[in-house]
Structure formats: C-alpha cells, structure tokens
Amino acid sequence: ASVGLPSVSLDLPRLSIQKDILTIKANTTLQITCRGQRDLDWLWPNNQSGSEQRVEVTECSDGLFCKTLTIPKVIGNDTGAYKCFYRETDLASVIYVYVQDYRSPFIASVSDQHGVVYITENKNKTVVIPCLGSISNLNVSLCARYPEKRFVPDGNRISWDSKKGFTIPSYMISYAGMVFCEAKINDESYQSIMYIVVVVGYRIYDVVLSPSHGVELSVGEKLVLNCTARTELNVGIDFNWEYPSSKHQHKKLVNRDLKTQSGSEMKKFLSTLTIDGVTRSDQGLYTCAASSGLMTKKNSTFVRVHEKPFVAFGSGMESLVEATVGERVRIPVKYLGYPPPEIKWYKNGIPLESNHTVKVGHVLTIMEVSERDTGNYTVILTNPISKEKQSHVVSLVVYVPPQIGEKSLISPVDSYQYGTTQTLTCTVYAIPPPHHIHWYWQLEEECPNEPSQAVSVTNPYPCEEWRSVEDFQGGNKIEVNKNQFALIEGKNKTVSTLVIQAANVSALYKCEAVNKVGRGERVISFHVTRGPEITLQPDLQPTEQESVSLWCTADKSTFENLTWYKLGPQPLPVHVGELPTPVCKNLDTLWKLNATIFSNSTNDILIMELKNASLQDQGDYVCVAQDRKTKKRHCVVRQLTVLERVAPMITGNLENQTTSIGETIEVSCTASGNPPPQIMWFKDNETLVEDSGIVLKDGNRNLTIRRVRKEDEGLYTCQACSVLGCAKVEAFFIIEGAQEKTNLE
C-alpha cells in the first residue's frame, strides 16, 4: 500500500514484499527490503524512534537508497504497520504484518501495564478498546468488571477488528471500572492488557493564555506561553496553536493534564508553547485552541519581539497638568520600551519617594493636591539592560477656587447697633484671581436660620431669594467700594468692601467670588438690635383656667441674664415699653419668677408659663436683660389681663319662617361666652350636613339654604357649647309650593 502525494520526480519507495498484508508465524525472521530514489527511513510498530535493539536496519549491499529491515524471532507484539518513507516527505509505502503468536494473540504496548479508554455516557457514542490482534480472524469478546459482563460482536454496533480493536457503544461499559479483550484459541483463553474506563464529557468552560497580554521580548530571548483549558470532568482535549512563524525549528509543544483537587467539578489541561530564541519573524498573534470534539474554544495574545532593548516616551505624555486644590492628580508615564524601564520621579530636581500623600511609579499620584505641589516634575526612564536614559518634564499648575478669609473667623451671626454705619468686608484668595466679586442681600425674616434647614456649617442660611445690592429697596442703603489688592500673609488677595449707611433693618449679606475653577461665598448676618421683646403665647388674652406663656426674646449676641419679675400691687403705667429707670434700678422690690430658657441661633427666649391662669395672675410682668458689653440692664413690661369664664349665651332669637320652594333662607345665631363657644346646627335633632344648597359661614354663625326644597322643611336648632355648658335656640321652617323636577337636580 502507498500513502502520500505522488511527486513529479519521485516514485514511491518499493518494498520487496508486494502485499498490503503479510501473515507470518512467531519465532520466524521478518525481513523486508525497501528501495527508492533518495534517502530512506523505516518506521515499525511500538517504536517510532528506531532505538529498538531487536530490529536491525541495514544498507543494502547492492546499491544506493536501499534499506533492509530485519527482525529475528518475531513475536506477536511485532504485529502492525511497517512503513518505508523518504526523509522529510509524506511519500511512503506500508505493509501490515501479522505475527501469529497463538500464545499471545493480543499486541501489548511495550510500556503499558494497563491502558486507558475515555468514554462518554452518551448512547450515541461508541468507544474503541485498542486490543489489536496478532491474528486477523480471532473470536474476541470484551469483558467488563465489576460486576462482570461479557460482550460478544453482534455484527452491528459491537465488533472487533484486528487492526483497530474492540468497538462497543460507550454507555454499555460506562458502569465498569476496567475492561479487557479475551480470545479463545483451541479452548484456551488469552487476555489483553487491562484498560481503565474513564467517562468523558465535552464542555470547555474557558481557555486562558498566560501571559494574557502585553508579551514583549527582544531577539534571542525565550518565549513561553501557557494555554490552560478548564473543562467539565471527564473531558479529553486536543490542543492546537497558531503563530506567525509556523516553520519553527526550535519550537516545543508540551500538553499535559493538570492535577485537580478532589471534589473539584472541573478539570484542567495545559499546553505550553516554547520558542527558545525568538526572532523578529516570531512577532505576531499567538492563538491557542482547545477542542473536545463538540466544543472548541480559543484565546489569543500578541507577542511583540524587539530588535534590541530600548526606551522612549510615548506621544501621549503630558507636559502641562492643571489641577484644583483637593483633587487627586494622576500623571501617567506613557512610554515605549523593552524591557519595562525603571522609573524615577523628581520635583524641582529632588527625588520623590512614595508616602501617604504621594505615590510614585508608572503613575505619579498626588492624593490631595495643594498649592505647594505646584512646580516642575521630571520623570527619568532607564532601560534596565542597555542603561539608556530618557527624561521628560511635566509642569503642574494648581488652581485654587475662591476662598474668603473672614469666613473662618466670623461667628454665624453678628449684631449691629440700630442706626449705625457699618462696613462689611470680603477678602478673597484664589488662583487665578477672581474675575468678579458680587454682593447680594436679603431680609433676615425672609431667611430663617433654623438648624433643621441649615445647608452647611459654613453657610447655615437656606435662602434663595437673594437680591443685588443695587436694589436696596426695603433694606439698608448701601455703597460698594472698588476692589483693592493686598499682599496678606505672603499671598495676593482681593478685598471687596460694602458700606451700610445706616443699620435700620436686619438683613443677610452675601459676597460671591468666582474664578475659572469655582466659586466661594460668605454670608454675613447683619442683625440690627435694640432691647428685648415680650410676646404672649397664645397671643389672645387668656381666660381663667387656660394656660398662657409669657415669652421674653432677646438677641443673644447683645443680651444675657434674662429674668422674669412681677410688679407688686402699686399702680404702673398701662402702656407697653421700657420701664422707667427706678423700676430697673429697684429690682429687689419685684417678685422674681421661675422661668425656662430656650435658645435658637439668634435669640435667647425666657418663657414664664402660667398653667390654669386665675384672676389673681393678672398684673404687670417685667423682663430684664443685661447688655453683654455694657452690662446695662434693659427692662420691658407687659400687662396681663385674665378674662373671667362665662357660660355660653345666644343673643337674639331664631324665628319661625315660611318660604316658597326655590327661594333662599338666611338666618344668624350669635353666641357669646368665655371661652368662646362652638356653634352647631341641627335639623329635626340630626346634625345638619353641608351640601351644595346648605352653606354654613363665620364659624357656623350664619346658615344659608339656597334653592329651598320641600325636604328642607323642619325644626332647626342652633346650639352653642363650651366647657361651661350649652345654650340653644330653635325655629321651624315651613316650605310652600309644589316640587319641580329640574335638570340641575
């Protein structure tokens, strides 16, 4: 038999035995001569390398390009294909030799004590157990264990072929741990080697190359690429590689199974590609493919081969970096080079080392950039092999958003004396300097400073309706001075001033400075203060047995030591206002009262609570506050009247009425009493419910019935009630006329 493509100039090697199959007996000598037209080699079973001691290959004595293969005392194991071929070509002639050894009918692999057969549990798959025969026409069965089962060729799916082995559907032996072939010759049984049964799958989870990317070498270095396929259990894998220089003389491929942990649901296979000394032609894409038969997965990596070690900066390397204070700055080193260079950073010529604020390396990272980080940074790349150096300078400019100096010094609220002239200042530091500073204002009462509404500590005012200072209607008269520039603490700062001609109104003022990287603002609370103030809670005059609170509110930046007193029975002026000096001077004559103090952001409030007020609680109450600076006392008086309790009374009577259908009824029910009574209406002793025709107004005092209907006829009651009892009046309304059905109804 001949294999290979016919060549234009070469005939196939010619064998001395012109047969496809040769059958000889064991212990005889096998001798085959091969003649051809150029250098020849022999390949024979069980030994592909030619190192078998029993086999002799000799040059023929009678001519060139002739070799004789001789095996004395052949054994069954010598059964197989004998191939004579031209070196470095596919042109070959083959003869299959059966060495009939009835004592050893199965060919055993020289090295194997046992074999392995991989199967799937799938019914569609057959498996070949490679128990080849030294005799072509044996009666062979397959034994599987445990439990022991015997399978006999059935002329269909179960068969034995001396050149191939025993073929059987894989599921039939998937239960077995091992199988072997058995031949019967003259009532004697002969067994092949044992084959361990391994059940295989097909699914490949992934194929991973390492190094996975950025593989770089220079000419002459060794390339090692590992390709790992992760599969489900019981998978067999074929690996293949695709690479630029496929005619590689010094390429090595090693495939092996990796040990997996017991209990693992995965199997790993490794294929390693090694090229001992790469050349420029080895540069390119390397692809590894793993295949189980039903699934193929691939992965690729690019291998770059450089002529020699080198280093250079990449085109994307920055020369100017701009940043804002507080930001994280990253200056990546963009370089081209092999092997990767050593990187050193310098600032203004001084080497930089990594610490908690700066990280140096492939990227210079400044965690929180500050003004002092401004400067020139030099990065020097050194090739570790050639020692070639390259340097590059990066200028870092750090911008500062406007910062207003006074912001950190002021308390959230300042107080200003009524009627005085005041100057408000904003001193701004910014890089670059602010391109404008604007002033705005807002009435204090329009922007309550309550902690729950506070936006931030530095700006506790949640106000939004800011007005430009040019529009000072309803506020204080204002003048904005031209900005000035000053060197303060070694920094160039911009100073903006606002002059308030007369402090008449409490307001908030805001200066806002803007530059290219941000804005800064300062809110100034311009609180105009006079003396303390008394209010009543609730603000109506109390009735006896009700509770009332007297609140004394004083600006806490101006006043302290708030105290409540009550005047004795001697008469006092009735008007509200500051008491004459003698009262403030002679506080010993007054009764000091227990009170509770509360504070908000601007005021102290001293609350004196009267629970179940009585007529004896009537009189004049004095709140005393002391000026924080001058220590002068300010006294304010408030007269408290307690009303007597009066049971409800209804003034005037309800009158019976006769009205026609469709007309309107209007009646009033006026009640008095202390506390003021609640008024309710009833019709035929049931609460009157408002609807489109029945309207109650003025705290139920006025009842109107529009478009009167027949069903509105009845007894109407007005009842006035309080905790002291009830009063009521009644009237009967008669409705005349026939009911008309209208569309409106």
């Epitope: 799937t120 799938n122 569609n124 097909y202 699914r203 989870y205 067999g236 894998i237 074929d238 690996f239 293949n240 695709e242 649901e265 692809t287 493919a289 793993a290 295949s291 189980s292 038969g293 039903l294 699934m295 193929t296 997965k297 691939k298």
Partner: antibody
Amino acid sequence: EVQLVESGGDLVKPGGSLKLSCAASGFTFSMYGMSWVRQTPDKRLEWVASISIGGSYTYYADSVEGRFIISRENAKNTLFLQMNSLKSEDTALYYCARELDGNYDYWGQGTTLTVSS
Amino acid sequence: HIMITQDELSNPVTFGESVSISCRSSKSLLYKDGKTYLNWFLQRPGQSPQLLIYLMSTRASGVSDRFSGSGSGTDFTLEISRVKAEDVGIYYCQQLVEYPFTFGSGTKLEIK
C-alpha cells in the same frame, strides 16, 4: 473570507458507501472543531458528527454510529465523512459546519446524498 | 435526547411589523455555569443556515439589532422588529446543553 465547499454527494444504492469532502479556506482550519449536519427532504436539520481540532475526539448521532466515520486532514484543510451501509433515511443535503464555542458559525452550501434503489 | 419543539408556521406578518417566533425545550437549557445554551439560525430560501443568536440572547457577528432573543429555561422567543423582505425563511432553534445537540423542526416566516 471563510468558505466551506462540500463535494462527493451522489445517488447511491442502499447498503452502498460514499465519502463526502469539505474543503475549507479563509481561516486556520486546524484551529476549529468541525461538524457535519444534514437537512432531510422535509427540511429538518439533524446533527450527524463532530470532530476535534486534532481529530482525536469524534462524536456521532445515534442514527449513524458505527456506519459513518468523520475525519480530517489539517494539512489539506479538508474534512471528510465516510458513509457506509447507507440507508434510504440517510437521503439529505449534507452541510459541513465550522464550530467555535459549540456554535456552528459558518456553513457550506451543502452536497446532496440520495440513497435509492 | 432533549426534544425541541417549534410551530411550523409563524403568524403571517406585514413588512415593518414585529414578529415573535417561539421554541420550547423538553428540558431546561440553563446550564450550571449560569448560561442558557440555546441558538437561533435563519435559513433563507436557497441558502445554508446562518447563526443569528447564541447563548439565548447574544447576537452573532454581523446580525442586525432587529433580532433579539429571550426566554427562560425551557421557553424561548426570537423577536424580529420591523420585518424586512430579507427576513423571510425558516428559523431553527438548537440546544447545546446536552449531547447530542438537537434542532427544532423550524418555523417558516410568512409574509402577508
């Protein structure tokens, strides 16, 4: 451009044999699993056989197991299907298909096998 | 084997409309790796099958975004929006979760 060209289809008597070939071009043949899929006259698609990139692992459908042999010759970018003991139910249009990740991403135009007496 | 069931014909559709083609599997195609191994193919008249969708919802290279796949473990849908003349043909689904890989019987897309 990926191309798969099947050939070898013919009219065969039941019990006969035939070998189909599929010539591949436009890609690295040895880096892909290959399969044969057939389309019956009623337009149903049926997977027939698959082979791993190196040819070590082969899989067959129940209906062809033991009768068909899939093989490949990577050096010649060719896939084969040796069909023996042919039956009338093997009559179909036979496609060769390239496989990656289990998916048949490219198919040939097909070659027709008719099994009839 | 895993059985794949498809309706023989889709509801006739007008150009520009959307159409859904369904496919049912006798067993869940959700594998333990979290992926659903279902593919969709289109066979245009006189041509060989072309892979449209793999892993239930991933479009194959060069496939129009008018095609989208969805489903659960056993019920799957191929949605074609704004149907064009070139969408006419037989649509096959195929399971890859268990060997042997099986195809559905195909659904013919009809145009009104």
